[in-house]
């Protein structure tokens, strides 16, 4: 049953004498494994014997052994799937039909495969895209219907006989669908490749030539042009004639139209390969080219620069840059259309020739205000001298010059006055638009450049102004020289350094921080009484009576200033001690008597000692000595001693008399 055998393999295989053939083949026998296999060459069915006749190229036996003469042909298949065959080497007489006779336990099948073996290696086939355009990448394909594992080959691309530098990609196929070797070359042809021969060369493994295929490249490209000009240097004078010729060196397809362009713009009614320019003018100077079009597009020649020579035209001056800042650099450029270019220049400043300036450019490295003005020039070439043009104005800008701050007030200025200042300058470009003042204050500017200071402070020493245009120029600071009464007057003890003790030599200084004018007078006062007119008040030997509140005054022509009251304190040992008795120095026994130690001391007495008429110290240390009840025996003379940090003082004796009471007298 033929439906049980399914084969897949290439229909025809191609090779040449001495090469090999590899036949990829698969099959399926549904009823079981392959029992025997015979490869016939040109098999024919014999009806009489019901068998196939023909050359047996290969025969497998049941025991799997293959006769030695069959080594040229190899069955590389298996019993159920693979029927791949190899013939190596393959010969011319192997051409024809190969018959694969397959037998399983119950079924038989004859599969036919065509084999085409040529005497010499057959050529590959080059495939080109339908159209090739310059600079557009194309893929060239070289296809050879051959591939065999036992016979390596290579395909090489040549351009006009030289191996092409582009790397080709070679692929092979040995499948049941197809057997081939293919080389693909990616290539961006230029117009110069048009008409050239590309070859795909088949070589063996050693690079030996086997066969080839060639094609002539048909590269579509825009016309390639050459322009020729008479005279050849394209340099003429006004009134001369010029001829330009356009030659097409290559065009594919043929060109259709011709035109001429000057400076990129098409010239009207110029549609031939020759451009004749008669009696040229300087306006005809420029870049000329011819443009020829075909179906691919327009092609342009290289440009020819036609130079029509003429004497310089009236010149103009370009200033880099105006306005210019004083101190900057400025460049003047003399511009004059001329051909050939001017070789000599004459420069003028405010109509006067500038000596030694003969170049196209004048460079002034450091601009000063006097450089301002009109600059003009004259250009000269071999054909003549041009005219002087209108010139260009150089504006030199600079900060305000000679700025001064001026005090408008009558002098001197006194603290509290209203002061008016003005800011003056000599010149400025551009004009002054604003003023600045230093230091800043809450001052009014009644008009531009005028500053009014109300109630001027004693410490307003200097003021500076700036006049500003694009820049600010500062004046030197001006001294206001504000006059004021002495400030910060105070009394300062300069001697002794420590506290004042009675008998010390004492000096007091009348200090002040500042005074303008500097000439001052001093006055010392105690309790409204004038003590002296020197800056110092001196005590050779201070007494407690000198203690008190002192003030000093300093005055100048503007006014006088008093210090705060300063208290002079004199320290002394207790003095003027006396013992006072209460209620009196005669007391009746049984009553209370209080003795008080009175003294004058600075600092106050800190410690009292009481003594009796025997100079015996009593155990009492407070200012008061209280006797209660008083006894007759208490009668006698008492004295006290006072102590402070300075020293001691003692009182004279004071006598206390205690008399008997009526009761005591009555008892007696």
């Amino acid at each position: 049953d033929s439906s049980k055998w399914v084969f897949e393999h290439p229909e025809t295989l191609y090779a040449w004498e001495g090469a090999c053939v590899w036949i990829p083949c698969t099959y399926r026998a549904l009823d079981g494994d392959l029992e025997s296999f015979i490869l016939f060459h040109n098999p024919e069915y014999n009806k009489n014997t019901s068998k196939f006749d023909g050359t047996r190229l290969y025969e497998s036996t049941k025991d799997g052994k293959v006769p030695s003469e069959q080594k040229r042909v190899q069955f590389l298949g298996d019993k159920n799937k693979n029927c791949t065959l190899s013939i190596h080497p393959v010969h011319l007489n192997d051409s024809g039909q190969l018959g694969l006779r397959m037998e399983s336990k119950t079924e038989k099948w004859m599969e036919r495969i065509h084999l085409n073996v040529s005497e010499r290696p057959f050529p590959p086939h080059i495939q080109l895209p339908p159209e090739i355009q310059e600079s557009q990448e194309v893929t060239l394909t070289c296809l050879l219907n051959f591939s065999c594992y036992g016979y390596p080959i290579q395909l090489q691309w040549l351009l006009e006989g030289v191996p092409m530098r582009q790397a080709a990609v070679t692929s092979t196929s040995l499948t049941i669908k197809s057997v081939f070797t293919r080389s693909e070359l990616k290539f961006s042809p230029q117009w110069s490749h048009h008409g050239k021969i590309v070859t795909c060369q088949l070589q063996d493994a050693d690079g030996k030539f086997l066969s080839n295929d060639t094609v002539q490249l048909n590269v579509k490209h825009t016309p390639k042009l050459e322009i020729k000009v008479t005279p050849s240097d394209a340099i003429v004078r006004e009134g001369d004639s010029v001829t330009m010729t356009c030659e097409v060196s290559s065009s594919n397809p043929e060109y259709t139209t011709v035109s001429w362009l000057k400076d990129g713009t098409s010239l009207k009614k110029q549609n031939t390969f020759t451009l004749n320019l008669r009696e040229v003018t300087k306006d005809q100077s420029g870049k000329y080219c011819c443009q020829v079009s075909n179906d691919v597009g327009p092609g342009r020649s290289e440009e020819v620069f036609l130079q029509v020579q003429y004497a310089p035209e009236p010149s103009t001056v370009q200033i880099l840059h105006s306005p210019a800042v004083e101190g900057s650099q400025v460049e003047f450029l003399c511009m004059s259309l001329a051909n050939p270019l001017p070789t000599n220049y004459t420069w003028y400043h405010n109509g006067k020739e500038m000596q030694g300036r003969t170049e196209e450019k004048v460079h002034i490295p450091k601009i000063l205000p006097w450089h301002a003005g009109t600059y003009s020039c004259v250009a000269e070439n071999i054909l003549g001298t041009g005219q002087r043009g209108p010139g260009a104005e150089l504006d030199v800008q600079y900060p305000p010059k000679k700025v001064t701050t001026v005090i408008q007030n009558p002098m001197p200025i006194r603290e509290g006055d209203t002061v008016t200042l003005s800011c003056n300058y000599n010149s400025s470009n551009p004009s002054v638009t604003r003023y600045e003042w230093k230091p800043h204050g809450a001052w009014e500017e009644p008009s531009l450049g005028v500053l009014k200071i109300q109630n001027v402070g004693w410490d307003n020493t200097t003021i500076a102004c700036a006049a500003c245009n694009s820049w600010c120029s500062w004046a030197s600071p001006v001294a206001l020289n504000v006059q004021y009464a002495p400030r910060d007057v105070r009394v300062r003890k300069i001697k002794p350094l420590s506290e004042i003790h009675s008998g010390n030599s004492v000096s007091l200084q009348c200090d002040f921080s500042s005074s303008h004018p500097k000439e001052v007078q001093f006055f010392w006062e105690k309790n409204g009484r004038l003590l002296g007119k020197e800056s110092q008040l001196n005590f050779d030997s201070i007494s407690p009576e000198d203690a008190g509140s002192y003030s000093c005054w300093v005055n100048n022509s503007i006014g006088q200033t008093a210090s705060k009251a300063w208290t002079l304190e004199v320290l002394y040992a207790p003095r003027r001690l006396r013992v006072s008795m209460s209620p009196g120095d005669q007391v009746m026994e049984g009553k209370s008597a209080t003795l008080t130690c009175e003294s004058d001391a600075n600092p106050p007495v800190s410690h009292y000692t009481w003594f009796d008429w025997n100079n015996q110290s009593l155990p009492y240390h407070s200012q008061k000595l209280r006797l209660e009840p008083v006894k007759v025996q208490h009668s006698g003379a008492y004295w006290c001693q006072g102590t402070n940090s300075v020293g001691k003082g003692r009182s004279p004796l004071s006598t206390l008399t205690v008399y008997y009471s009526p009761e005591t007298i009555g008892r007696r």
Epitope: L158, L159, E160, G161, V162, P163, R165, Q190, S192, H193, K196, I197
Partner: antibody, heavy 119, light 108 residues
Framework: EVQLLESGGGLVQPGGSLRLSCAAS????????MTWVRQAPGKGLEWVST????????YSADSVKGRFTISRDNSKNTLYLQMNSLRAEDTAVYYC????????????WGQGTMVTVSS | EIVLTQSPGTLSLSPGERATLSCRAS???????LAWYQQKPGQAPRLLIY???SRASGISDRFSGSGSGTDFTLTISRLEPEDFVVYYC?????????FGGGTKVEVK
Amino acid sequence: EVQLLESGGGLVQPGGSLRLSCAASGFTFSSYAMTWVRQAPGKGLEWVSTISGSGVSTYSADSVKGRFTISRDNSKNTLYLQMNSLRAEDTAVYYCALHWELLDAFDIWGQGTMVTVSS
Amino acid sequence: EIVLTQSPGTLSLSPGERATLSCRASQSISYNYLAWYQQKPGQAPRLLIYGASSRASGISDRFSGSGSGTDFTLTISRLEPEDFVVYYCQQYGSSPLTFGGGTKVEVK
């Protein structure tokens, strides 16, 4: 097979002249631009001169301009380099090379010929 | 004239290592028209790379080129014994055609 074979090298005195030839085979000679490149002993490569396939256009390095002339005879498949006023610094191996465009990389090189300029 | 500077002058590496050769141009090379050549002792140079990055026919894919403008690189991915020779870069974007001074790749 493409082949480039240089000849004509040798020893020459300073101020002398020499003509190098490069015989080409295996390809369409007139289709390819040709170039001479030299290499002084132990030094790098230096481009000398190039000629277009037709022979119309030529370019030369400044170092040889006015002294060396490149030319070709397409009927004989031969490239030439006429070297006059030779100097010691012209001592080098001179290679010919082929390429498609006038300004191009060099696809195939000859094996070179040695020129020695010495007194 | 475009000056080509190759660095380093000598590159010492071991077989199997990756080699990176640099070629720097004094000005931009139009259309990246830069080629690399290999020169074995006593032989003529051989074209490896053209157009900065296109490998020439028959050249191993171990060789690759990259770069544009003024900086170009030749990379040899795995050095084989036969790769330890001299390499030159060349610009053909403008006349005069110029070569770099060369880089020698030597065995470490």
